[in-house]
Structure formats: structure tokens, C-alpha cells
């Protein structure tokens, strides 16, 4: 697994280098997570033909995966920094149960899956420091998450493969939208 941002030897070996700003650190963290997702997607696609699944088939699911919408204020039209930041943090918190599900779903990329999960927790902390209106952020109910996790793990193998593929695809799209929005802040 790649070394998380801020932990590579170059940072230690170059004390004269300017420390990263909060925004740069967040940007780097998201890009690091996206690299991890790419590696996981590669294993998923090599293992089965899930990656050829049609958008229609993937749309027929009952997963409530976070998705950016116009009202969230993260798109160029109608951009709203505070609303968007709340959406990004809330969405990442909602993704956490799905990232927990991904653990044990990978044979050769177990460490990578763990790295994506842990790096997302760090990203949430970075963003919470940036947010002014923390009260507007709703945390998912742990009991609901626990029963969702149990339900996902009870699915047959094909459904679990499809679910894994969809989570990775949706998380990638959510992070890419977040990255674009955060660069406007």
C-alpha cells in the first residue's frame, strides 16, 4: 500500500520545505484515497466481469450510497461552500459502513482496503476542522449501520461482488466531486 500523505521519508528529509496548508493536505489525502480505490477496482475487475456490468443493472440496487446532487451546493452552478462542506463530511461518514464492508472482500489487496478505510477517517477529521457549522452534520446511527452490514454480508457471492464494485465506483465518483468542489473553496 502507498504511504499515507505526510508519512513519506521525503517529508522528514526536507525540513526546509514549506509545510502543507490545510487545503493542500486535504487535496493530497483525497488523491491518495483515489489511488487506493483504483488498486481495489483493479482486483475486482480482474476477478470477475463485474466491471462490464451495465449502468442499468447497477442502478437496480437498494443501497443508499451517498451521491452529490444540485441542492448540495458542490457544483459550479449554485456553489455554496458551507452547504457543500457539510454534504462532503456527511457523505463520507455515510460511506464508512460501506468501507467497513469492503474489509475482507479482497484477497491480494487487504492492506489497500484497510488503508482506504483509515485514510478516509483521517480525511473526515481534516474536513471537520475546516467546517464552521458542525451541528449541521448528521452522524449515521450505529445500530442501523450494524444491521446494514449484517445484511450486506449475508448476500450471495454474486451480489457481494456487485455490491463491492458499486461501492468502489460510487465512492470514487463522490471523492472526485468533492475534490473539484474543495478546490473552489
Amino acid at each position: 500500500a502507498p504511504v499515507p500523505p505526510g508519512e513519506d521519508s521525503k517529508d522528514v528529509a526536507a525540513p526546509h520545505r514549506q509545510p502543507l496548508t490545510s487545503s493542500e493536505r486535504i487535496d493530497k489525502q483525497i488523491r491518495y484515497i483515489l489511488d487506493g480505490i483504483s488498486a481495489l477496482r483493479k482486483e475486482t475487475c480482474n476477478k470477475s466481469n463485474m466491471c462490464e456490468s451495465s449502468k442499468e443493472a447497477l442502478a437496480e440496487n437498494n443501497l443508499n450510497l451517498p451521491k452529490m446532487a444540485e441542492k448540495d451546493g458542490c457544483f459550479q452552478s449554485g456553489f455554496n461552500e458551507e452547504t457543500c462542506l457539510v454534504k462532503i463530511i456527511t457523505g463520507l461518514l455515510e460511506f464508512e459502513v460501506y468501507l467497513e464492508y469492503l474489509q475482507n472482500r479482497f484477497e491480494s489487496s487487504e492492506e489497500q482496503a484497510r488503508a482506504v478505510q483509515m485514510s478516509t477517517k483521517v480525511l473526515i477529521q481534516f474536513l471537520q476542522k475546516k467546517a464552521k457549522n458542525l451541528d449541521a452534520i448528521t452522524t449515521p446511527d450505529p445500530t442501523t449501520n450494524a444491521s446494514l452490514l449484517t445484511k450486506l454480508q449475508a448476500q450471495n457471492q454474486w451480489l457481494q461482488d456487485m455490491t463491492t464494485h458499486l461501492i468502489l465506483r460510487s465512492f470514487k465518483e463522490f471523492l472526485q466531486s468533492s475534490l473539484r468542489a474543495l478546490r473552489q473553496m
Epitope: 456490468s53 442499468e56 443493472a57 447497477l58 437496480e60 440496487n61 437498494n62 484477497e107 445484511k151 449475508a154 448476500q155 450471495n156 457471492q157 454474486w158 451480489l159 456487485m162
Partner: antibody, heavy 119, light 111 residues
Framework: EVQLQQSGPELVKPGASVKMSCKAS????????MHWVKQKPGQGLEWIGY????????KYNEKFKGKATLTSDKSSSTAYMELSSLTSEDSAVYYC????????????WGQGTSVTVSS | DIVLTQSPASLAVSLGQRATISCRAS??????????MNWFQQKPGQPPKLLIY???NQGSGVPARFSGSGSGTDFSLNIHPMEEDDSAMYFC?????????FGGGTKLEIK
């Protein structure tokens, strides 16, 4: 052709244990989950649990925890189920069944192993 | 657990006529466009024979007179025309998730 060949009938005494086998052929054994199902004479079907031969991960019906133990042997492409502390309630036919994969592969069942518990 | 309610419990149909067996699930057995409902036929002393998988696909060697339909929570097995050899027990089963669950069975006889 996918085939599951189960071991022969067993007549066992109460309190004893029994271990039955399910030999798979015609597919990659480690790529599919193997389930076990119980059917008492003249009754319906009841899921016991499954084993994933790739990593030996198991999942059991709460009712059969402590009663059934699922194992597998990759080298011989064989799944096993051991039943312990047998009583007359365990007299039944036990089936192994390979899980399908989406609409591409159908489930496939063995012919069953009959277990009779009697003193 | 997903509960499957099968009806009727028994059914007598004349040769050449249509037999319809229903199976209702307590929650949807669909996922990503596939309905994980299977139908089995069982004769005394024999293992269950897979007739229909994923709601409407025929098992290998299954005659065309057996057909399955439905999605979500409501499914049915149709046999038409009814033949002598079709007298047996029929079960529905969901394989969407564990525990696998089964309907109570329908005893189909010749009228």
C-alpha cells in the same frame, strides 16, 4: 459437467458423531461457496450453513452452531460436514449444494446422505 | 430471515391442464436486476431437482412445460400441460442471502 458426489448412508448410535463428504467435480472447487441443507423424513428443507473453500470461511444457521462443523479439502475438492452429539432429531437426509453465480451459473445439488440415529 | 409462503399446500390438476403454484417472500429477493428465486421438484426417496433458477431460467434437461415468473416478492411456477410424471412435491427457495429459506411445499397430484 458440474457434479457433487456425496458419501453413503450412515446408521449411528445416539451420542456419536458422523462425518459425511461431498466431492465436487466439473468446476474450480475454490471459486464457489458450498452450502449444506437438512431434510427430515416427509418434511421441508432447512439450511445448515456454508463454507467458502477458498479461505475456509464459514457461516452457520444459529440452530446448527455446535451441532454441525463444516470443513473442506482443496487438494481433493471435497467438502465435509461433521454432526456431533447425535439424537433422533438428527435423523435426516443431508444435501450439499454449490451456490450459483448470478444468472450465469445455477445452484447444483448432491444426491444426499441419509443419516439414521438409532440405538 | 426471508420467509417464503407457498400456496396452495396441495393441488389436484387434470392431465393436460395448467397447474400454478405461488410463492410470496416477506421481502424482495431481487438484487441488481436478478430475482434470486428457485423452484424444485421432489419425488419420494429422491433429492430435490432444480426446475427453475433466478425466477425464470430453466434448469438443464427440464421440459419446456415448466416455466417460472415473477419479481420482487411474488413468484409463480406454471406447469402446462400437466403430465403423469409431474405428480410430486414442489418447493420454492430464495438464494439472495443466507440463511437460504424454503417454501412449505405444494403437493401436486393428478385429478
Amino acid at each position: 459437467e458440474v457434479q457433487l458426489q456425496q458419501s453413503g448412508p450412515e446408521l449411528v448410535k445416539p451420542g456419536a458423531s458422523v462425518k459425511m463428504s461431498c466431492k465436487a467435480s466439473g468446476y474450480t472447487f475454490t471459486s464457489y461457496v458450498m452450502h449444506w441443507v437438512k431434510q427430515k423424513p416427509g418434511q421441508g428443507l432447512e439450511w445448515i450453513g456454508y463454507i467458502n473453500p477458498y479461505n475456509d470461511g464459514t457461516k452457520y444457521n444459529e440452530k446448527f452452531k455446535g451441532k454441525a462443523t463444516l470443513t473442506s479439502d482443496k487438494s481433493s475438492s471435497t467438502a465435509y460436514m461433521e454432526l456431533s452429539s447425535l439424537t433422533s432429531e438428527d435423523s435426516a437426509v443431508y444435501y450439499c449444494a454449490r451456490e450459483g453465480y448470478g444468472n450465469l451459473e445455477r445452484d447444483c445439488w448432491g444426491q444426499g446422505t441419509s443419516v439414521t440415529v438409532s440405538s | 430471515d426471508i420467509v417464503l409462503t407457498q400456496s396452495p399446500a396441495s393441488l389436484a390438476v387434470s392431465l393436460g391442464q395448467r397447474a400454478t403454484i405461488s410463492c410470496r417472500a416477506s421481502e424482495s429477493v431481487d438484487g441488481f436486476g436478478i430475482s434470486f428465486m428457485n423452484w424444485f421438484q421432489q419425488k419420494p426417496g429422491q433429492p430435490p431437482k432444480l426446475l427453475i433458477y433466478v425466477a425464470s431460467n430453466q434448469g438443464s434437461g427440464v421440459p419446456a412445460r415448466f416455466s417460472g415468473s415473477g419479481s420482487g416478492t411474488d413468484f409463480s411456477l406454471n406447469i402446462h400441460p400437466m403430465e403423469e410424471d409431474d405428480s410430486a412435491m414442489y418447493f420454492c427457495q430464495q438464494s439472495k442471502e443466507v440463511p437460504w429459506t424454503f417454501g412449505g411445499g405444494t403437493k401436486l397430484e393428478i385429478k
